[in-house]
């Protein structure tokens, strides 16, 4: 009797189990009772990540420049093309077919995380003692100037912008 | 015990015709792939024609094709090989095989076909 | 079609020898191929299937090896009854083809 399901590696052609084509290789044709599936290399610039019976290979992603786009791992006959953006630039997706610029973290913020290729820049408030006073995309919440270990005193408060200032104690006349 | 019995070789002049049967024993015939292989005297072996279980799918080898036609007769557990316009290069003993999962198995003893004026 | 080469042609050995075949094929046939062995006035034998696989009954001698484009059948200690005519056969594209043979004679 004809099979009616193959196995994983296998597929169904004229009531016969054929053999899939193992990644980086197309189908050229399909097995019968005398041959078994014959499959080629995919070519230059081409690449099947799967077991398939595809007649055509993918073409590898082009990472295009004037997108900010270089490439981060040349593609194989079994991989695709990974590509990433240029330094301060990062994908607008998980597939990186364009980039944009890193987000900076405006005065009253810091950088939580800093960006990457394929992810932008994380900002987060500074809390109470912490101050930003820039709009950057790599410096942090910095911490209130200490006027005590200075033995000065805060003459002016600070806020999430803007660090205390520290002035000289009072002296009793 | 699986066997397979070669008939109908002979003389025959160029341009003539023959018809070989391969009496098949032993196995469920028709779950099984057949084919014909030939031999020329002092020659290696050449796969000439194969055909499936169910008669759907026939293939056969360049030198032979438009000449030669495979068929079977499953409820007469027959496979056979109608050869026309023969020419002397198609001298040679004939086989019959059993394929399974891509390997012939099992071999008749073979039949001999001259071509000859 | 695809091309299948064996070689030697012919070989002499000793019975007890290790004996070793080759066969290439003009382009890659993973691990499709097929060894048989033929006697004089006998029809052909299959002794080894799928490049490696030895067939049910056929002595431990015998063994297979290869992928891609290029195989060998070994015979790791002759006995007289293996002097004969080995010859591959690709099944990796239509249509099957075999090798020219190699003729195993006695020294």
């Known amino acids: 009797e004809p099979p009616t399901a193959c196995s994983d590696k296998q597929y169904l052609h004229d009531g016969q189990c054929c053999s899939l084509c193992q990644p980086g290789q197309k189908l050229v044709s399909d097995c019968t009772e005398f041959t078994e599936t014959e499959c080629l290399p995919c070519g230059e610039s081409e690449f099947l990540d799967t077991w398939n019976r595809e007649t055509h290979c993918h073409q590898h992603k082009y990472c295009d420049p004037n997108l900010g786009l270089r490439v981060q791992q040349k593609g194989t006959s079994e991989t695709d093309t990974i590509c990433t953006c240029e330094e301060g630039w990062h994908c607008t997706s998980e597939a990186c077919e364009s980039c944009v610029l890193h987000r900076s973290c405006s005065p009253g913020f810091g950088v939580k995380q800093i960006a990457t290729g394929v992810s932008d820049t994380i900002c987060e408030p500074c809390p109470v003692g912490f101050f930003s006073n820039v709009s950057s995309a790599f410096e942090k919440c910095h911490p209130w100037t200490s006027c005590e270990t200075k033995d000065l005193v805060v003459q002016q408060a600070g806020t999430n912008k803007t660090d205390v200032v520290c002035g000289p104690q009072d002296r009793l006349r | 015990e699986v066997q397979l019995l070669e008939s109908g070789g002979g003389l025959v002049q160029p341009g003539g015709s023959l018809r070989l049967s391969c009496a098949a024993s032993?196995?469920?015939?028709?779950?099984?792939?057949m084919s014909w292989v030939r031999q020329a005297p002092g020659k290696g072996l050449e796969w000439v024609s194969g055909?499936?279980?169910?008669?759907?799918?026939?293939s056969y080898a360049d030198s032979v094709k438009g000449r030669f036609t495979i068929s079977r007769d499953n409820s007469k557990n027959t496979l056979y090989l109608q050869m026309n316009s023969l020419r002397a290069e198609d001298t040679a003993v004939y086989y019959c095989?059993?394929?399974?999962?891509?390997?012939?198995?099992?071999w008749g003893q073979g039949t001999l076909v001259t071509v000859s004026s | 079609d695809i091309q299948m080469t064996q070689s030697p042609s012919s070989l002499s050995a000793s019975v007890g020898d290790h004996v070793t075949i080759t066969c290439r094929a003009s382009?890659?046939?993973?691990?499709?191929l097929n060894w048989y062995q033929q006697k004089p006035g006998k029809a052909p034998k299959l002794l080894i299937y799928?490049?490696?696989s030895l067939q049910s009954g056929v002595p431990s001698r015998f063994s297979g090896s290869g992928s891609g484009t290029d195989f060998t059948l070994t015979i790791s200690s002759l006995q007289p009854e293996d002097f004969a005519t080995y010859y591959c056969?690709?099944?990796?594209?239509?249509?099957?083809?075999f090798g020219q043979g190699t003729k195993l004679e006695i020294k």
């Open positions: 382009q890659s046939i993973s691990s499709y």
């Open positions: 056969q690709q099944y990796g594209s239509a249509p099957p083809t």
């Open positions: 799928a490049a490696s």
């Open positions: 055909i499936g279980g169910s008669s759907s799918y026939t």
């Open positions: 032993g196995f469920t015939f028709s779950s099984y792939a």
């Open positions: 095989a059993r394929y399974y999962s891509y390997h012939m198995d099992y």
